[in-house]
């Protein structure tokens, strides 16, 4: 699989994807904020 995330539980895999999505959204917001502040 693409980024080295490995788990034997499908629900755990889905949770990892949800966390990744959340972090991407948070980091994306921070990045946009930094650009705006510049």
């Amino acid at each position: 699989h693409s980024d080295g995330i490995f788990t034997d539980s499908y629900s755990r895999y889905r949770k990892q994807m949800a966390v990744k999505k959340y972090l991407a959204a948070v980091l994306g917001k921070r990045y946009k904020q930094r650009v705006k502040n510049k």
Partner: antibody
């Protein structure tokens, strides 16, 4: 209501590859877990793998590791399953399916792939 | 991989009678999140499978209440309380708890 429409039947030679498409409508494609399942004639169902389009993250069944590639094009809400080094045992109907509650709630109509010399 | 064993392979039942299909997994399907991802599919000839029951006992919307699912851990049952002509199909159990996701071999339900 989610709808999955798959590409048409294919006839392939042993050793070649096949690429089947699955176009989704009526849902959030990027945030769906798209699976591929196959069914040989008169046989049961076999899970091949999945993709989570938002991150293009794939998981493949051990049996197909190295021979299957699942991709997704978010711009067209289409998933693809490519199977290489085809042999006669790969003759099957290939289905895409979208997960809800770790259960396949929506299925494509199926694509028959025939491998014959 | 988790092995899903269905029994019987085929079943002939009179209209209005009860049909019972068993499904056994080689390992518990209870996940760490407290849910059990055991599902049942119905497949009619020439059609894709259709979700019937998920999370052991939750009926898909539109599925008649004569269909019910039960069980826990490794042992599960699909019951059709009063068989109708339109229930003739192959039924599959499958598990979505562990990778690789795996299916039972199917049970063909016919009318006696």
């Amino acid at each position: 209501e989610v709808q999955l429409v798959q590409s048409g039947a294919e006839v392939k030679k042993p050793g070649s590859s096949v690429k089947v498409s699955c176009k989704a409508s009526g849902g959030t494609f990027s945030d769906s877990y798209m699976h591929w399942v196959r069914q040989a004639p008169g046989q049961g169902l076999e899970w091949m793998g999945l993709i989570y389009p938002i991150f293009a993250d794939q998981r493949y069944a051990q049996k197909f590791q190295g021979r299957v590639t699942i991709t997704a094009d978010e711009s067209t809400s289409t998933a693809y399953m490519e199977l290489s080094s085809l042999r006669s045992e790969d003759t099957a109907v290939y289905y895409c399916a979208i997960d809800q509650d770790a259960s396949f709630a929506y299925w494509g109509q199926g694509t028959l792939v025939t491998v014959s010399s | 991989d988790i092995v899903m064993t269905q029994s019987p392979d085929s079943l002939a039942v009179s209209l209005g009678e009860r049909a019972t299909i068993n499904c056994k997994s080689s390992q518990s399907l209870l996940d760490s999140d407290g849910k059990t991802y055991l599902n049942w599919l119905q497949q009619k000839p020439g059609q894709p499978p259709k979700r019937l029951i998920y999370l052991v006992s939750t009926r898909e919307s539109g599925v008649p209440d004569r269909f019910s699912g039960s069980g826990s851990g490794t042992d599960f049952t699909l019951t059709i309380s009063s068989l109708q002509a339109e229930d003739v199909a192959v039924y599959y159990c499958w598990q979505g708890t562990w990778f690789d996701l795996t299916f039972g071999g199917g049970t063909k339900v016919e009318i006696k």
